[in-house]
């Protein structure tokens, strides 16, 4: 249950978060599961533990394996497992499936491609973006914070997109790359498995305490009239109406039919007077139709006055 897959490339930085969390004051111990050997905390080591984070600076193929993290709370020792695989760099341009993060789908209206895992790193804008190994150039492509925006999306924009950034640790720089597929839907009159355009999977949404915040769950279900389609929000796995927090309400948006004909729905989650404890909740955007259910999870983080890092 508390296990997480992580992967990276040799000679790049890889940072893994313990699947169990805890207060900053809690001690987190990391072990290499196969040998039960403790991971050092001294930063002079190439692989070291830093609280909830396990850092490979840089990673080596031999680092692959299962790592155990134990969060020592005042009552229980809470255990998580990080299954880490480090791959050799490919000589050709193709990115193998096992290095790919989740596929995102876009439309003319919504074409954000988020750089996976970037929030774990100490990086500075701008990001570099590549499509099928070619650096993206032209006014249609805009690197904004941790995502890429493509204007006037066309079917030809489908492909594998790689973000590249530099992680800085105590003055030393390490390269990180992450790749995910981007698909564009443009067939005639069809129904497909829901595609959540927003939020991105595991998105971190910045909010200000005391202010109001809106989260939009936007999903597309195909072209033309859809027999059954719905989008909704859940809080910690519970329906909004059952959660019982009057400050948090969902409000149905308008049915949208984009210029390329996609049938999409929006659901806006309105949080009035954001409180600290709202940052601890898990917000799930659910999209469902006859094909099935897709879920994207969002967490809130406090907006810092100066946003150096993701």
């Amino acid at each position: 249950k508390f296990s997480k897959q992580s992967w990276g490339l040799e000679n790049e930085a890889l940072i893994v978060r313990c699947p169990r969390q805890g207060k900053p004051s809690y001690t987190v111990d990391w072990y290499y599961s196969q040998t039960n050997k403790s991971i050092p905390t001294q930063e002079r080591n190439r692989v070291f533990a830093s609280g909830q984070l396990l850092k490979f600076l840089p990673a080596a193929v031999a680092d692959s394996g299962i790592y155990t993290c134990i969060v020592r709370s005042p009552t229980f020792n809470r255990t998580g497992y990080a299954n880490v695989t480090i791959y050799k760099k490919q000589s050709d341009c193709n990115v193998p499936d096992y290095l790919m993060y989740s596929t995102v789908s876009g439309s003319e209206k919504n074409s954000k491609i988020y750089c996976p895992t970037i929030d774990l790193y100490n990086w500075t804008a701008p990001l570099e973006w590549f499509k099928n190994c070619q650096a993206l150039q032209g006014s249609r492509y805009r690197a904004h914070k941790s995502f890429l925006v493509i204007d006037n999306v066309m079917t030809e924009d489908a492909g594998d997109y790689t973000c590249k950034f530099i992680h800085n640790e105590n003055g030393a720089n390490y390269s990180v790359t992450a790749t995910r597929s981007f698909t564009v839907k443009d067939e005639q009159g069809f129904s497909l498995f829901p595609v959540i355009g927003a939020p991105a999977q595991n998105e971190i949404k910045e909010v200000e305490i005391g202010k109001n915040a809106n989260l939009t769950c936007s999903a597309c279900f195909g072209k033309g009239t859809q027999f059954l389609a719905a989008v909704l929000w859940q809080l910690n796995g519970t329906k909004i109406t059952d959660f019982g927090e009057p400050r948090i309400q969902q409000e149905e948006g308008q049915n949208q039919s984009f210029s390329n004909g996609l049938a999409c729905l929006d659901m806006v989650l309105r949080i009035a007077d954001v409180k600290e404890e709202d940052l601890l909740l898990q917000y799930d955007c659910l999209a469902l139709n006859l094909h099935g259910l897709r879920r994207h999870t969002v967490r809130l983080s406090r907006k810092n006055p100066i946003d150096h890092h993701s």
């Epitope: 249950k1 169990r20 969390q21 805890g22 207060k23 004051s25 969060v71 709370s73 005042p74 009552t75 229980f76 809470r78 910690n236 796995g237 519970t238 059952d242 600290e276 404890e277 601890l280 909740l281």
Partner: antibody
Amino acid sequence: QVQLVQSGAEVKKPGASVKVSCKASGYTFTDYELHWVRQAPGQGLEWMGTIDPETGDTVYNQKFKARVTMTADKSTSTAYMELSSLRSEDTAVYYCTRAFYNDYDDAFAYWGQGTLVTVSS
Amino acid sequence: EIVMTQSPATLSLSPGERATLSCSVSSSVSYMHWYQQKPGQAPRRLIYDTSKLASGIPARFSGSGSGTDYTLTISSLEPEDAAVYYCQQWNTSPLTFGGGTKVEIK
């Protein structure tokens, strides 16, 4: 809506045992540790211990360690607290309670309605 | 075991007045939680992690402190604030509560 519903009041004789139940709903039972807190009449709150329903692991307050047993039934999302060798000073309201967000131990946000246990000869 | 001492035992104030409740700890803790309890009811979470206001709690309640000394402040008392208030530490096992401060409204 998170709910913790406890069993009804009990009257026990000294030396007997009592088993209080706490049925959880509105969340995934195995994702949150459940704690037991008691309150004697006119007195303060006293933490008795906690159980991880996923594993059945327990941590007890040393004061009760010899007499308390906490268990959890995953199939019914119900936690139990059994206290043995009862004495008059065990007369109290017994609460089951849960943190708001488990891994952060951010105070007891959800409480059962309480179960009054009276120990009298 | 960490011993929590709350003072005063009873606080009697008029509506609109400021109430300051103290919680002293026998050894340093990282966080403090505060609860309100009214007769015949289960405790209610007021403040968690020293200063964070729980959902649905009015802004007149605030918490502060560090180390061994923590404070719950009610900036302007309302009649419905009459209750017993408890501090609690979750720093080490066993978890412990203070003896409580009873707030009376004149």
